[in-house]
C-alpha cells in the first residue's frame, strides 16, 4: 500500500481466482484512543472498533472511503483505491490502446518545435468518475524538471455504438535549449483513477522524435505567363524554432485532382517556393518536415488551383 | 528519406555539401545496422545514449546560433571566442562565428573516425561476418575533415590484444551510430546556418 495523495491510498492487488488479497491496516488520524468505530462509504454498518482497523482487501468491494468516527463525529477518512494486476499484468482498462505507432500505445505526444514544450493526449470511453494527474521529468534516475498543466477534455467523438473522449495535457521543460542534443529521454507519467480503480501509464521519448511542425503558412499561387504552370510559395509556420537557417525544414508539394484515384504529382524541396502544373479542379498542398531529422510530416496546407 | 537531392552551387559554403553527405551516410549506415542486427538491442529505445565526445569537445555550445545566445539554458558552458580559422570560412563574413565551433566539429569527426576504424577492425575478425562499416561513411568523414582543414595531431588507431567480444562490439556500434547521427544533425544545422549568414 502506498499514498497517492493526502488520505488517498493505493492497494496493489495481484488478483487471481481465490487470491488471498492484501492485508491492510488503517489508522485513525486522531489523538483519541477509545470509542472509535469504522464505516465504509455511505453504509452505517460498523466494520470494527479501535484506533486501527485491519481489513483483507480481495476485490473492489473492499475498496472505498473508510471513515473513523467517535460519538457521531467524523475523525478522519482514508480512501482506498485498487491497482490490480491480473495474469501478472497491471490493468490498463481506463485508457484505450491507440495502437499507433505500435501496440500498447496509450499516451501519444507531439511537439511543434524544439522549445521543450509538448502536448500529450489519450483516449477513453469512460465519461464519469474519472480523474487524471500528469507528472513529467527529463530522465528518471536524476530527474530534471518538466512542468505539466492539468489534463483537460479536448475532444469527443462517436465511434460506432461508443463515445470516445480525448484528454490532453501541455508540458514544458523547465530549462530547455532548442539546440541541445538530448541524451536522456522525457518521461511522462499519467495517474488515472476511475471510481476505485487506479492505473498508471507512462511514455518515454526524445523531443526530436515527436516533432511535428505546424503546416506551412501563407500558401499562395502565382500563375506564370503563357503557361499552365504556377509558382507556389509559402512560409515557415510561426510556431517553428528559430533561426530557420539552423532549424531548417524541407517541404513536400503535392498536386491532387478532385478524385482520390487521380495520380498525385509530388515535388520535394528545401526552398519555400516551387513551380508546378496546376490542373483544372486540382488543389495544391504543401507539408513540412525537419530537414535533418526525419520525424513526422506536418499536416497539409492546401489551396485550390482555380 | 528518398528525396530528390539538389546539387549545391559551386560557390556555396564548401562544408555544407560534405555535411549533407555525412548525415545521409550515417543515416543509411544506422538503418543498415538496425536491419542487420535486428535481434540485438539497436533501436533508439533500447540503447544507452552515450556521447564519446562528452567533456572533450563542446560542439553544441561552441556552434550555438547568435539568436540562441540569449537563451540561458543554452549557455551553461558557452565560450565566446570570435576568432575565425579554417578553409570553410575562406570567403565568408564570419565575425560572429567561432573558430572553436569548426575546430570542435573537426575534433568530433576525428574521435568518431578513430572509434569506427577500431571497431571495423574488430568486426572484420568476426567469423559470422555479419556487419561492417560502410566505407562510404568513413570516406565522407574524411572529406569533411579535409574541407575543415584544421591541422591537428593524428590520433593512433586503438589496438587491442584481447579477443574481441563480437556481441558487445555490435552493441557498441549501434550506440556509436545513434550518437554520431545526432551529432551529424547538429553539424548539418551549423553548416546550414553558416551558409545562410
Amino acid at each position: 500500500i502506498w499514498e497517492l495523495k493526502k488520505d488517498v491510498y493505493v492497494v496493489e492487488l495481484d488478483w487471481y481466482p481465490d487470491a488471498p488479497g492484501e492485508m491492510v491496516v488503517l489508522t485513525c488520524d486522531t489523538p483519541e484512543e477509545d470509542g472509535i468505530t469504522w464505516t465504509l462509504d455511505q453504509s452505517s454498518e460498523v466494520l470494527g472498533s479501535g484506533k486501527t482497523l485491519t481489513i483483507q482487501v480481495k476485490e473492489f468491494g473492499d475498496a472505498g472511503q473508510y471513515t473513523c468516527h467517535k460519538g457521531g463525529e467524523v475523525l478522519s477518512h482514508s480512501l482506498l483505491l485498487l491497482h490490480k494486476k491480473e495474469d501478472g499484468i497491471w490493468s490498463t482498462d481506463i485508457l484505450k490502446d491507440q495502437k499507433e505507432p505500435k501496440n500498447k500505445t496509450f499516451l501519444r505526444c507531439e511537439a511543434k518545435n524544439y522549445s521543450g514544450r509538448f502536448t500529450c493526449w489519450w483516449l477513453t470511453t469512460i465519461s464519469t468518475d474519472l480523474t487524471f494527474s500528469v507528472k513529467s521529468s527529463r530522465g528518471s534516475s536524476d530527474p530534471q524538471g518538466v512542468t505539466c498543466g492539468a489534463a483537460t477534455l479536448s475532444a469527443e467523438r462517436v465511434r460506432g455504438d461508443n463515445k470516445e473522449y480525448e484528454y490532453s495535457v501541455e508540458c514544458q521543460e523547465d530549462s530547455a535549449c532548442p539546440a541541445a542534443e538530448e541524451s536522456l529521454p522525457i518521461e511522462v507519467m499519467v495517474d488515472a483513477v476511475h471510481k476505485l480503480k487506479y492505473e498508471n501509464y507512462t511514455s518515454s521519448f526524445f523531443i526530436r522524435d515527436i516533432i511535428k511542425p505546424d503546416p506551412p503558412k501563407n500558401l499562395q499561387l502565382k500563375p506564370l505567363k503563357n503557361s499552365r504552370q504556377v509558382e507556389v510559395s509559402w512560409e515557415y509556420p510561426d510556431t517553428w524554432s528559430t533561426p530557420h537557417s539552423y532549424f531548417s525544414l524541407t517541404f513536400c508539394v503535392q498536386v491532387q485532382g478532385k478524385s482520390k484515384r487521380e495520380k498525385k504529382d509530388r515535388v520535394f524541396t528545401d526552398k519555400t517556393s516551387a513551380t508546378v502544373i496546376c490542373r483544372k479542379n486540382a488543389s495544391i498542398s504543401v507539408r513540412a518536415q525537419d530537414r535533418y531529422y526525419s520525424s513526422s510530416w506536418s499536416e497539409w496546407a492546401s489551396v485550390p488551383c482555380s | 528519406r528518398n528525396l530528390p537531392v539538389a546539387t549545391p552551387d559551386p560557390g556555396m559554403f564548401p562544408c555544407l555539401h560534405h555535411s549533407q553527405n555525412l548525415l545521409r551516410a550515417v543515416s543509411n549506415m544506422l538503418q543498415k545496422a538496425r536491419q542487420t542486427l535486428e535481434f540485438y538491442p539497436c533501436t533508439s529505445e533500447e540503447i544507452d545514449h552515450e556521447d564519446i565526445t562528452k567533456d572533450k569537445t563542446s560542439t553544441v555550445e561552441a556552434c550555438l546560433p547568435l539568436e540562441l545566445t540569449k537563451n540561458e539554458s543554452c549557455l551553461n558552458s558557452r565560450e565566446t571566442s570570435f576568432i575565425t580559422n579554417g578553409s570553410c570560412l575562406a570567403s565568408r563574413k564570419t565575425s560572429f562565428m567561432m573558430a572553436l565551433c569548426l575546430s570542435s566539429i573537426y575534433e568530433d569527426l576525428k574521435m568518431y573516425q578513430v572509434e569506427f576504424k577500431t571497431m571495423n577492425a574488430k568486426l572484420l575478425m568476426d567469423p559470422k561476418r555479419q556487419i561492417f562499416l560502410d566505407q562510404n561513411m568513413l570516406a565522407v568523414i574524411d572529406e569533411l575533415m579535409q574541407a575543415l582543414n584544421f591541422n591537428s595531431e593524428t590520433v593512433p588507431q586503438k589496438s587491442s590484444l584481447e579477443e574481441p567480444d563480437f556481441y558487445k562490439t555490435k552493441i557498441k556500434l549501434c550506440i556509436l551510430l545513434h550518437a554520431f547521427r545526432i551529432r551529424a544533425v547538429t553539424i548539418d544545422r551549423v553548416m546550414s546556418y553558416l551558409n545562410a549568414s
Epitope: 488478483w15 487471481y16 481466482p17 462509504d41 480481495k58 476485490e59 473492489f60 468491494g61 490490480k84 491480473e86 495474469d87 482498462d93 470511453t125 469512460i126 460506432g160 455504438d161 461508443n162 476511475h194 471510481k195 476505485l196 480503480k197 | -
Partner: nanobody
C-alpha cells in the same frame, strides 16, 4: 443507453440445471465486466458471479462456486450463467449487470442492470 435483457429462467427441480442468458445492446459490450446478482424474497440482492472484459477471468460467490459457470460471447454481446446442481436456496430473481470494476461483489460498482428473470428450484 445500454439495455440488458435476461432470459432462461423457470421452474426446475432440485439437482437440475438451467442456463440463463443476458443480451446487451446500445454500447460496445466488450468494454465492460459482466456480472450476475440474485434476490430471494425478503432478502437483499446478493452477488453470484462476474466475468472480466479481457481475459474472461471469473469470480464467484462462495455459495455457488463449483456449481455455476459464467461465460461470455463478445461477438454476440451475451453473457451466460450455467447453473448445475441447483438447490431450493438458489430460488431468486436473477439480474444481469455490467460495470467497469473487476473483481467486485458490490452492487454499487455496477452501472447498468437488467429487469431480472425468475428462477424457482422446487424440492
Amino acid at each position: 443507453e445500454v439495455q440488458l435483457v435476461e432470459s432462461g429462467g423457470g421452474l426446475v427441480q432440485a439437482g437440475g440445471s438451467l442456463r440463463l442468458s443476458c443480451a446487451a445492446s446500445g454500447r460496445t459490450f466488450s468494454g465492460y465486466d459482466m456480472g450476475w446478482f440474485r434476490q430471494a424474497p425478503g432478502k437483499e440482492r446478493e452477488f453470484v458471479a462476474q466475468i472480466s472484459r479481457h481475459n474472461s477471468n471469473t469470480y464467484y460467490a462462495d455459495a455457488v462456486k463449483g456449481r455455476f459457470t459464467i461465460s461470455r460471447d463478445n461477438a454476440k454481446n451475451t453473457v451466460s450463467l450455467q447453473m448445475n446442481s441447483l438447490k431450493p436456496e438458489d430460488t431468486a430473481v436473477y439480474y444481469c449487470a455490467i460495470g467497469s470494476l473487476f473483481p467486485s461483489s458490490r452492487e454499487r460498482d455496477y452501472d447498468y442492470w437488467g429487469q431480472g428473470t425468475q428462477v424457482t428450484v422446487s424440492s
